[in-house]
């Protein structure tokens, strides 16, 4: 009889290993900015401290009238769902709450950043162990909030938001839209999307990964002892949040970037029914839904990597779009792919110290999206080797000229607008291996890195008939860093990863044009890390 | 989210209003002005004033002190709500929007952004 | 049907720290439905709650015994217990053990204690 | 602390008589409210919870109203096996109860 939503985010073998320490206080402290809360409710009593902080506007409305347990109701819940005694998912964390939305749930920018420089002020007062911030709020986009959480974030504090309750793109809301913080959708107990009446949750890009958030039962602030359901990205963001805490209680030196990675990749896959979601964001939408990973000494130096996606560039003739990974992150590969098929390519160029992942759109193309395959490799050493396009007829090739640097992935950029003179480049896995070969007018670029243990192959896949994508995966123990897509029909939208599957994109039109002989094909780069081995290509 | 989304952001280079400060009518403006794409959430009135990122602590406050000192000049009174330090160099103040030409040419001020109001989700 | 039932010694001198069990029939202990509860009745007076605990441990107690009280649970044997430290005469009383739906799982049934053990006198004296 | 203050203490009446008991609040306790019936020897039995709700295997006779801070219980018709010592209880902010109101044969 344990509720849905725990026993979807922990799986079996945690149950028992929690119930064997309930009240194992950690060192983890979880900072809402919230509502007001109840702290005598005998979920979050004697785990919860309510600060003096309010910074909070107005009720809007004279008939107002303030009750208690309502002005409690949100911020009571979310508590109990990061810590509760009974009904949490990390019930034994410290929590500190923070008022930054009034009785009816409204607050301000200012009063969010104000708060924030709270926790930081505080963070700098009395060092402690890591911090969690929730922040179960959203507003429309805001410039000075994401970049506050920015700031934040680069202290070590790890934040997670709701991605926003209004059926829409989370990019377009903050702190949803920060690349900093860890956005969360909401699933229902089918994990298919919440809906909330006529809207639900958001979605998109800016959404890492989804988790509970549909009839939640948790402390409800109409009396010490009362629970009650409620559903929303907030619950959501507080799963998560709650996961993190007992990540970081289990290992208290995890970074932000190692937090990300591991809940997207040891997160449920596929089982989000995607048509739920318009269709130009479906497939920038994560399939993933939150579960507590194990410990990072029972999965041993596995290589994580995730897809981020680039803003859309915009329709434009010179129109580019950037990707970036995080800081601690390497920038492996870099794809594009374009829904009309016009795209000039991509590459990666350093900017500001930072690899980033551009994208080029067509003249009479709709606009690119650049994607980058962002990866944790401990001790990485990556460079980029591109060659210029070489003349008419000619190939170009690029390899991993350094000792004990593999190729982890490959792009390519054209110089010509017209797409019908171009063939598409091609990866050479056989004859030339670890080389990205380019054709006609287009330059090259080469990911090339090296680390302990580093090992990578391609693989391919390749369709004659008639098909929309064409996919190939990296099996177990391996993990995609590069896709692309080879020569085949003269139009193609594009690659891009999707969890350990490269996906291979061409245009409807093109199919009807292809003979059967011209296959188009998906490249995957798999690598691997192990630790004791040498860095090497695996032929 | 790196280019700015849903998003206003308006360039308010207004001619300079001269009022015998040298330093102000030679500075011209290349902050930028920003609100929220949803009008029924926007609270006019009230601004964030976003300093570069190396402005020193002293500096946020001469600056603050500034945009009062040249308010008043034109008749205006204007409240500090708020001063930031410790997460980026800024302050809060609620003052008239005819204001935001002046502040937006203040010097070390990178961009307004008016405030705006979030939601419990 | 579920029965409780209280054990424990019905004399205990002052300063002595009293304790008692309470025994769960006809129903598991471990169910997420449920907390249990102590609850204790002077001779002639009205009822006091002590504290109540759930099947992973976890407790909460009455903000005035909160510094005397101990409670405890053994899953294995279906059993909840009471320890109270420092008595006096004042923790004279009828010790009542009692089932307290959790509120986690709603449909568990009214937040309430209900059904109660028969109870069991415990007298502090020298 | 909420305190509960149960009136009158003692309530003397005839079988078949109608009881009406009161359980005021010091601040308000919304709807959670419980009612026990205790007699002699015995261990309290839940009547009515959540102000107004009967419990299990409750006669009809007796029924719960109010919310806030007022309270009342009502035996429509008492039988002989009603005579006890009635306690409310609340739970809004963790418990206590109230300090009993007997109902004894007149």
């Known amino acids: 009889s344990i509720p849905w939503n725990l026993e979807r985010i922990i799986p079996a073998w945690h149950q028992t290993e929690e119930d064997r320490s309930p009240d194992g206080s950690s060192q983890v402290e979880v900072y809402l900015l919230d509502t007001s809360i109840q702290g005598a409710h005998r979920e979050i009593e004697g785990r919860v401290t309510i600060t003096d902080f309010n910074s909070v506007p107005e009720e809007d409305g004279t008939r107002f009238h303030r009750q208690a347990s309502k002005c409690d109701s949100h911020g009571t819940h979310l508590a109990g769902v990061v810590s509760g005694r009974d009904a949490g998912v990390a019930k034994g964390t410290s929590l500190h709450s923070l008022r930054v939305l009034n009785c009816q749930g409204k607050g301000t920018v200012s009063g969010t950043l104000i708060g924030l420089e709270f926790i930081r002020k505080s963070q700098l007062i009395q060092p402690s162990g890591p911090l969690v911030v929730l922040l179960p709020l959203a507003g429309g986009y805001s410039r000075i909030l994401n970049a506050a959480c920015r700031h934040l974030a680069r202290t070590g504090v790890v934040l997670v938001a709701a991605a926003g309750n209004f059926r829409d793109d989370a990019c377009l809301y903050s702190p949803a839209s920060a690349p900093e913080v860890i956005t969360v959708g909401a699933t229902n107990a089918q994990d298919q999307p919440v809906t909330l009446g006529t809207l639900g949750t958001n979605f998109g890009r800016c959404v890492d990964l989804f988790a509970p958030g549909k009839d939640i039962i948790g402390a409800s602030s109409d009396c010490s002892t009362c629970f009650m359901s409620q559903s929303g990205t907030s619950q959501a963001a507080a799963h998560v949040a709650g996961i993190v805490a007992r990540m970081l209680s289990r290992e208290p030196t995890l970074t932000l970037a190692e937090l990300r990675q591991r809940l997207i990749h040891f997160s449920t896959k596929d089982v989000i029914n995607m048509a739920w979601f318009p269709e130009d964001q479906q497939v920038l939408t994560p399939n993933l839904v939150a579960t507590l990973p194990p410990s990072t000494h029972e999965t041993g130096g596995q290589l994580l990597c995730r897809t981020v996606w680039s803003a859309h560039s915009g329709p434009t003739r010179t129109a580019t779009a950037t990707a970036r990974c995080a800081p601690e992150e390497e920038l492996l590969s870099c794809s594009s792919f374009s829904r009309s098929g016009r795209r000039r390519g991509d590459w990666i160029e350093a900017i500001g110290g930072q690899q980033v992942c551009k994208a080029l759109n067509a003249f009479g193309g709709e606009g690119v999206y650049a994607v980058a395959r962002c990866c944790l490799v401990p001790r990485a050493n990556c460079s980029i080797h591109n060659t210029p396009a070489a003349r008419a007829g000619l190939e170009t090739h690029v390899h991993c000229h350094q000792k004990d640097h593999v190729l982890t992935g490959c792009s390519f950029h054209w110089e010509v607008e017209d797409l019908s003179v171009r063939r598409q480049p091609a990866l050479r896995s056989r004859r030339q291996p670890g080389q990205c070969v380019g054709h006609q007018a287009a330059s090259v670029y080469a990911s090339c890195c090296h680390a302990p243990g580093l090992e990578c192959k391609i693989k391919e896949h390749g369709i004659s008939g008639p098909s929309e994508q064409v996919t190939v995966a990296c099996e177990a123990g391996w993990t995609l860093t590069g896709c692309n897509v080879l020569p085949g029909a003269s139009l193609t939208l594009g690659a891009y990863s999707v969890d350990n599957l490269c996906v291979a994109r061409v245009h409807d039109t093109a199919r009807a044009d292809r003979t059967s002989g011209e296959a188009t094909v998906a490249a995957a780069i798999c690598c691997r890390s192990r630790p004791s081995a040498k860095a090497s290509w695996v032929q | 989210q790196d280019e700015d989304g849903d998003y206003e952001e308006l360039m308010l280079a207004l001619p300079s209003q001269e009022d015998g400060l040298a330093d102000e009518a030679a500075h011209v403006a290349t902050a930028t002005f920003r609100r929220c794409s949803k009008e029924a959430w926007r609270l006019p009135g009230t601004y964030i004033v976003v300093l570069m990122e190396e402005t020193q602590r002293l500096q946020i406050e001469q600056t603050a002190h500034r945009l009062q000192t040249r308010a008043a000049r034109r008749g205006y009174v204007i409240k500090v709500l708020h001063i930031f330090y410790d997460l980026f160099p800024g302050f809060l103040v609620k003052m008239s929007s005819d204001l935001l030409g002046l502040a937006l040419k203040l010097p070390h001020v990178e961009y307004i952004e008016e405030d705006s109001f979030v939601f419990a989700q | 049907q579920l029965q409780l039932q209280e054990s424990g010694p019905g004399l205990v001198k002052p300063s002595e720290t009293l304790s008692l069990t309470c025994t769960v029939s006809g129903g598991s202990i471990s169910s997420s439905s449920y907390y249990w509860g102590w609850i204790r009745q002077p001779p002639g007076k009205g009822l006091e709650w002590i504290g109540s605990?759930?099947?992973?441990?976890?407790?909460y107690y009455n903000p005035s015994l909160k510094s005397r009280v101990t409670i405890s649970v053994d899953t294995s044997k279906n059993q909840f217990s009471l320890k109270l430290s420092s008595v006096t005469a004042a923790d004279t009383a009828v010790y009542y053990c009692?089932?307290?739906?959790?509120?986690?799982?709603?449909?568990?049934?009214?937040?309430?204690?209900?059904?109660w053990g028969q109870g069991t006198l415990v007298t502090v004296s020298s | 602390e909420i305190v509960l203050t149960q009136s009158p203490a003692t309530l003397s009446l005839s079988p078949g008589e109608r009881a009406t008991l009161s359980c005021r609040a010091s601040q308000s306790v919304s709807s959670y409210l419980a009612w026990y019936q205790q007699k002699p020897g015995q261990a309290p039995r839940l009547l009515i919870y959540d102000a107004s709700n009967r419990a299990t295997g409750i006669p009809a006779r007796f029924s719960g109203s109010g919310s806030g801070t007022d309270f009342t219980l009502t035996i429509s018709s008492l039988e002989p096996e009603d005579f006890a010592v009635y306690y409310c209880q609340q739970r809004r902010n963790w418990f206590t109860f109230g300090g009993g109101t007997k109902v004894e044969i007149k």
């Open positions: 009692a089932r307290e739906n959790s509120g986690v799982v709603p449909a568990a049934g009214p937040n309430w204690f209900d059904p």
């Open positions: 605990i759930y099947y992973s441990g976890s407790t």
